[in-house]
């Protein structure tokens, strides 16, 4: 056969020749040729690589930065970049993890739907009628109005989304 | 084209060293592959002596023990070949080559 | 150190024949890559030696299409299917999977 114009999976083609990839973990030192094997070094300390490749240098790991709220969720190896995520109570920006921000608070009238992880913010729901919440929180739900029947009380207050409803004694006048 | 040229002395006295040129045209040493040499003796066996890579690491025959040596001038582009005590067993065509592409072969003659 | 045996050690032919050399390992010569650095060189009187055929049976760069190798592990063959004038000579397989690299002893193709 003449040299080829394509070849097999975890190849490449250079000068006419199919050579091997380098494996996840190593980078590219020379191509193979005629007569010898693509040869591949380990990454350093440090660096990765993580697909069968032709790179003639690692790429670094991931600097999980203190002072942008980031820690190290899981070390990176020579086939892994190391996963960053956000100190608690902060969650990340983009899915990339650069940076991270406090997580939002729910204000008065909202609760928390879900609450906020190392990825993803708060969620917040209004309260809706029958229930409230009276405080800036990043975890308290939407609490139900107290039931002032169930106290043998009357309702002297209405509730709001923001406010229990406020209850009094029954009118004896009124038995 | 890449052109591989040998040169050195056709007679050599026992006991003294061999010290072989290749001169390298068309493709820089230091890109890739293995320059190796390789002699012919009389009777036409083929015996691979040993290579210098583009990197500048060595590989040699076991058999020519620690008599062997090659090591290369990057700015000539040049690789040498360098062979104490030599005998008469040392008598041959040496070759100087990437295996695609070969030097024409100098003959050397160990006599005193 | 793998050796390599070539049979036959001469082959005379006719001009059109189709010619066939075996080179036989003591080893395989496939590494932890599944690739074989088998290849196969002409020699024709007074020149260096010539590459024909390398990884076992890709042709060289403008050798004709008469020339083929196959095999695999420790048996190969090298085939011309029309002999030509000009394929005289002697005819060496040499393996450079291993170190040290090792040739076979060569087949000398003649006119019968």
């Known amino acids: 056969p003449e040299p080829p114009t394509a070849c097999r999976e975890k190849q490449y083609l250079i000068n006419s020749q199919c050579c091997s990839l380098c494996q996840p973990g190593q980078k590219l030192v020379s191509d193979c040729t005629e007569f010898t094997e693509t040869e591949c070094l380990p990454c350093g300390e440090s660096e990765f690589l993580d697909t069968w490749n032709r790179e003639t240098h690692c790429h670094q790991h991931k600097y999980c930065d203190p002072n942008l709220g980031l820690r190290v969720q899981q070390k990176g190896t020579s086939e892994t970049d190391t996963i960053c995520t956000c100190e608690e109570g902060w969650h990340c920006t983009s899915e990339a993890c650069e940076s991270c921000v406090l997580h939002r608070s729910c204000s008065p009238g909202f609760g928390v739907k879900q609450i906020a992880t190392g990825v993803s913010d708060t969620i917040c729901e209004p309260c809706p009628v029958g229930f409230f919440s009276n405080v800036s929180s990043a975890f308290e739900k939407c609490h139900p109005w107290t039931s002032c029947e169930t106290k043998d009380l009357v309702v002297q207050q209405a509730g709001t989304n923001k406010t229990d409803v406020v209850c009094g004694p029954q009118d004896r006048l009124r038995a | 084209d890449v052109q591989l040229q040998e040169s050195g002395p056709g007679l050599v006295e026992p006991s003294q060293s061999l010290f072989l040129t290749c001169s390298v045209t068309?493709?820089?040493?230091?890109?890739?592959?293995?320059w190796n040499w390789i002699r012919q003796f009389p009777g036409n066996k083929l015996e691979w002596m040993g290579y210098?890579?583009?990197?500048?690491?060595?590989n040699y025959n076991p058999s020519l023990k620690n008599r062997i040596s090659i090591i290369r001038d990057t700015p000539k582009n040049q690789f040498f070949l360098k062979l104490n005590s030599v005998t008469t067993e040392d008598t041959a065509i040496y070759f100087c080559?990437?295996?695609?592409?070969w030097g024409q072969g100098t003959s050397v003659t160990v006599s005193s | 150190d793998a050796v390599m045996t070539q049979t036959p050690l001469s082959l005379p032919v006719s001009l059109g024949d189709q010619a066939s050399i075996s080179c036989r390992s003591s080893?395989?010569?496939?590494?932890?890559?599944?690739?074989?650095?088998l290849n196969w060189f002409l020699q024709r009187p007074g020149q260096s030696p010539q590459l024909l055929i390398y990884?076992?049976?890709n042709r060289f760069c403008g050798v004709p299409d008469r020339f083929s190798g196959s095999g695999s592990g420790t048996d190969f063959t090298l085939k011309i299917s029309r002999v030509e004038a000009e394929d005289l000579g002697i005819y060496f397989c040499?393996?450079?999977?291993?170190?040290?690299?090792?040739f076979g002893g060569g087949t000398k193709l003649e006119i019968k």
């Open positions: 080559t990437r295996l695609d592409y």
């Open positions: 040499l393996q450079v999977t291993h170190v040290p690299y090792t």
């Open positions: 080893q395989s010569l496939e590494n932890s890559y599944g690739n074989t650095f």
């Open positions: 210098i890579r583009h990197d500048g690491t060595n």
């Open positions: 068309g493709y820089s040493i230091t890109t890739n592959y293995n």
């Open positions: 990884r076992v049976s």
